[in-house]
């Protein structure tokens, strides 16, 4: 039977235990918020908030400035002092709930859990390539704010998301806060609001527009705001909330809320349910037809996509897509299928579905039974009526009231379940060349940088490494600064290059030079690295062949052996066709003549495994000595492949030339009819790849082969006679003169 090279798992070409050390900053406490700033004049900064403190870092993550933001009531609290002599409220620690940039000024705005959730504005002062914060301004006017109406109460202790939008000369803060009965009773933050920052930075203009969970639902209906972003003409919030006001509050789903970024009003507030599922290619018995639902959004990010993913999503390159990591429930615990799935929602299609949903509600003829929804924000009503009203009045428009679109937007896991047990806790998507890369942080403190593609049954990793030794979860919010992403884990901030931390996790030259161009990987003799790591020997144009195994491990000194070589970088072409004169194999001093590839034996190799086979016929030279020797493969003048050309030599020890010896044959006679079981004894009888026992020139069918013994069944004899018996190994006769006597049956 043909011997076949053992498959090498694709994973063997990389090592995700390789340690990478990326720049980091120890914040001195659990990182609560982080934001980056890049100015017009090459100045940049990273702002990192922990309990009671705000750090300003330079682009190198070195501390530039530090500001005390609490505890409230403490004389050392620098932000509190900006509000004038106190007391301003109950004393207590300040946990930063909001940290955003107002690009128009530019300024940093921070809002905390203390002092009724008020905010502070810090003008940015460039100093060379670094940035300092000016003295904070307190965004709170005591005479404007009351417990039941507080335009300057922004942050909720339960969590707040803010997106700042410039409209004309004004900055509008799109604010979404989680509420419960206790929070709502204390200086009344709102669920969703749009607030204009006053020009004199004394707070936010009164009379702002807002939506809030109705008091009767506050206890049972809680909305978590996971992410917010601004693209095109809209601001979007992503929420996790109960699927129904009336049913089980633990049955959660994910919604997208859309607000106009051009008009500071909430009449065109729209919500849409996002449905993300894992639909395995082969459905298990009993599995739901549409796939397993993953209703709870954990993290999200929107980004323009590269050409390849755009094609797979049937959209144009550069279009904005919302990516979300979803889990099965709040605890994200394992069910059947992966822990985390990633779904892609093209923004244009989201907008189209919302727009068509609005028209379905508002156009005539009326679609009977269609509800306006959002019963936690407003009185129930049917389309096209406004909330709480039985009919439209002539001076109201159906379109000028909030609406839940009746259809959900459904997508399936981009990774086809391949994230498996990984629990993703952070996500940032970038476009590099024509590739779209998801940079993911995990529950166990790792960073996974993976190409976003649909059509594969394995993950294409840029990298997969541990941020540090703490193993603490990577936090949800990720920021970009130049060509780096900033991830927070525990009390540390880490700076990870978007091109990946390095190339050392690629173990083979082939894998190294097949890496994405943007990674800048090259081969350094025996490792994969970036040019700065090994400037002397670094190259990106060729790989030597790599021998990993061969068969057989021994061959006869006289006679031929069909040698099968295993390894990688033999061909670079799936067909395995070798141009004349490019591959030279020597075993010891003896050449091994390349054999044409038998196309009938070509097997498709799954991309998760890789192995290349090369066959040659070994005919030892007369000068070849018995004993151990090396197998050497040299490849030259190969036409270049897609990523590199093959060029170089690989040597592997462990082949032995042996001389088979035949010592005894028994029995020496048998019936003319044949079928006598002959036993041939000797040494090195199993070497090489072919052997034959000939009785009067006819083959004696081999039943068993071992190093010291051959068993075969004699063929029928023509007459009663003594006939020659010989053993050939590799086509050459083993020395010795033997006869076998055919007798009457």
């Amino acid at each position: 039977e043909d011997w076949q090279c053992p498959r090498t798992p694709y994973a063997a070409s990389r090592d995700f235990d390789v340690k990478y050390v990326v720049p980091s900053f120890s914040a001195g406490g659990l990182v609560q918020a982080m934001v980056t700033y890049e100015g017009d004049r090459n100045e940049s900064a990273v702002f990192v908030a922990i309990r009671n403190r705000l750090h300003v870092l330079g682009p190198d993550l070195k501390s530039v400035q530090s500001l005390a933001t609490g505890p409230a009531g403490d004389p050392g609290c620098q932000t509190c002092a900006a509000c004038g002599p106190g007391p301003h409220g109950p004393p207590g620690d300040t946990d930063t709930k909001v940290l955003v940039l107002d690009p128009a000024l530019p300024a940093l705005v921070s809002c905390g859990s203390s002092l009724q959730g008020r905010c502070f504005l810090h003008d940015l002062e460039p100093q060379g390539t670094a940035v300092h914060l000016a003295a904070p301004a307190c965004l709170f006017s005591a005479h404007h704010n009351r417990p039941d109406d507080c335009p300057d109460c922004v942050a909720s202790p339960l969590g707040t998301r803010v997106t700042v939008v410039e409209q004309g000369q004004a900055s509008y803060f799109y604010v979404a806060s989680s509420l419960d009965a206790a929070v709502a009773a204390s200086f009344s933050p709102r669920s969703v609001s749009i607030r204009r920052l006053k020009a004199d930075a004394s707070g936010f203009a009164p009379g702002f527009v807002a939506l809030s969970v109705l008091p009767k639902h506050l206890v049972s209906y809680s909305i978590e705001y996971v992410h917010s972003f601004h693209t095109g003409a809209f601001v979007y919030f992503l929420t996790v909330q109960p699927a129904s006001v009336t049913d089980d509050p633990s049955a959660l789903h994910t919604r997208l809320a859309r607000l106009s970024a051009t008009e500071p009003e909430l009449g065109d507030y729209r919500e849409l349910v996002l449905d993300c599922r894992f639909a395995p290619k082969r459905r298990r018995r009993g599995a739901p037809e549409g796939g397993q639902p993953y209703p709870v959004l954990r993290v999200a990010h929107s980004a323009p996509v590269g050409a390849q993913l755009a094609t797979e999503l049937s959209i144009a390159e550069g279009q904005e897509v919302l990516f979300g990591v979803f889990v099965t429930g709040k605890d994200g615990g394992p069910g059947v299928g992966p822990n985390s799935v990633v779904c892609a929602f093209p923004i244009d299609l989201l907008d189209t579905l919302i727009d068509e949903g609005v028209e379905r509600c508002c156009e005539s003829p009326v679609h009977p039974g269609l509800r306006r929804g959002l019963d936690f924000f407003q009185s129930p009503s049917f389309c096209p009526n406004p909330p709480g009203l039985e009919a439209l009045s002539p001076n109201t428009s159906c379109r000028h009231f909030p609406l839940l679109v009746s259809s959900s937007f459904s997508r399936v896991d981009l990774f086809n379940g391949l994230l498996g047990p990984v629990q993703v806790t952070a996500l940032y998507v970038t476009r590099l060349d024509n590739v779209t890369v998801a940079h993911m942080g995990t529950m166990d403190g790792r960073i996974l940088q993976v190409e976003l593609v649909r059509s594969l049954n394995y993950l294409l990793y840029v990298s997969n490494f541990s941020l540090g030794d703490s193993g603490q979860p990577v936090q949800r919010d990720v920021s970009r600064l130049g060509d780096h992403l900033l991830f927070a884990s525990g009390d540390q901030v880490f700076q990870v290059p978007i091109q990946g931390p390095g190339c050392r996790h690629f173990l083979t030259c082939g894998r190294c030079l097949r890496a994405w161009h943007f990674m800048g990987c090259g081969w350094c003799g025996n490792m994969c690295g970036q040019q700065k790591e090994c400037p002397g020997s670094w190259q990106q144009d060729h790989c030597p062949p790599k021998l990993t195994e061969f068969h057989p491990h021994s061959g006869p000194l006289r006679g031929s052996t069909r040698l099968t070589l295993c390894g990688s970088n033999f061909y670079l072409h799936p067909s395995g066709l070798v141009p004349e004169g490019t591959h030279q194999v020597t075993v010891g001093q003896s050449p091994c003549r390349p054999l044409p590839k038998d196309s009938s034996k070509l097997r498709p190799v799954p991309r998760k495994d890789f192995v290349e086979e090369f066959e040659c016929e070994l005919e030892p030279l007369g000068t070849q000595a018995v004993g151990p020797t090396n197998v050497s493969l040299t490849v030259t003048n190969m036409p270049p492949g897609k990523h590199f050309r093959v060029d170089g030599t690989s040597v592997l020890r462990g082949f032995s030339f042996m001389e088979p010896v035949l010592i005894a044959v028994q029995p020496l006679f048998g019936p003319r009819a044949g079928g006598t079981c002959l036993t041939l004894e000797g040494q090195s009888l199993s070497v090489g790849t072919s052997r034959a026992v000939l009785v009067n020139g006819t083959e004696c069918l081999l039943a068993r082969v071992s190093e010291g013994q051959l068993l075969c069944a004699t063929p029928p004899g023509a007459t009663v006679a003594s006939v020659p018996l010989s053993l050939q190994v590799g086509g050459a006769q083993v020395p010795g003169s033997w006869t076998f006597q055919y007798r009457e049956d």
């Epitope: 639909a279 049937s314 144009a316 299609l349 189209t352 068509e356």
Partner: antibody
């Protein structure tokens, strides 16, 4: 009420070009995605192309990809189909239709395109 | 591309009878993005069902859609004279969107 009226059909030689228009009225045109569907004489329906409400997303049937271009002018409430390199097999009645997520709920009456030498 | 196969090609029934039309997809039509359309000779098609089972506005209750994944059915509970026409299914989840070849419901 909703109305979709196609125009621009006619006789054209193989390799030639034609531009179909679909004038929409009676609804908020810029809120709806639109499609073109065709029907060869005596044959079934064949979906041709789709465009989203803001024109950012377009889809095409394999049979017309690279030859046909769908577009819209929301200020004029008009949908277009630019057809180049026409072939005999493109001969059909071309319909424009409104909507996507809730099905194509309104259709025009169609315009006949004949490709023949 | 998803191929839709409708059966039977022709259905000969009398008014008042129940009509069951089948549409089978070559691969799963995710989230039931499947519609049914009615077309009479010389007329434009008319939407009957979207999302596999939702009746379009103004469509009589005798029309109902069911199924998911790869097998979908349009049922006309009791045929009226005006229901004799050709019916097409359409998948609109994966571009390119595709129609079935049609089922003609004719008077027996």
């Amino acid at each position: 009420q909703v109305q979709l009226v196609e125009s621009g059909g006619g006789l054209v030689q193989p390799g030639g070009s034609l531009r179909l228009s679909c004038a929409a009225s009676g609804f908020t045109f810029n809120s709806y995605s639109m499609s073109w569907v065709r029907q060869a004489p005596g044959k079934g329906l064949e979906w041709v192309s789709y465009i989203s409400s803001r024109s950012s997303t377009t889809y095409y049937a394999d049979s017309v990809k690279g030859r046909f271009t769908i577009s819209r002018d929301n200020s004029k409430n008009t949908l277009y189909l630019q057809m180049n390199s026409l072939r005999a097999e493109d001969t059909a009645v071309y319909y424009c239709a409104r909507g996507y997520f809730h099905g194509m709920d309104y259709w025009g009456q169609g315009t006949l395109v004949t490709v023949s030498s | 591309d998803i191929v839709l196969t409708q059966s039977p090609a022709t259905l000969s029934l009398s008014p008042g009878e129940r009509a069951t039309l089948s549409c089978r997809a070559s691969q799963s039509v995710s989230f039931d993005y499947l519609g049914w359309y009615q077309q009479k000779p010389g007329q434009a098609p008319r939407l009957l069902i979207y999302g596999a089972s939702n009746r379009a506005t103004g469509v009589p209750a005798r029309f109902s859609g069911s199924g998911s994944g790869t097998d979908f059915t349009l049922t006309i509970s009791s045929l009226e004279p005006e229901d004799f026409a050709t019916y097409y299914c359409l998948q609109y989840f994966n571009p390119p969107h595709t129609f079935g070849q049609g089922t003609k419901v004719e008077i027996k």
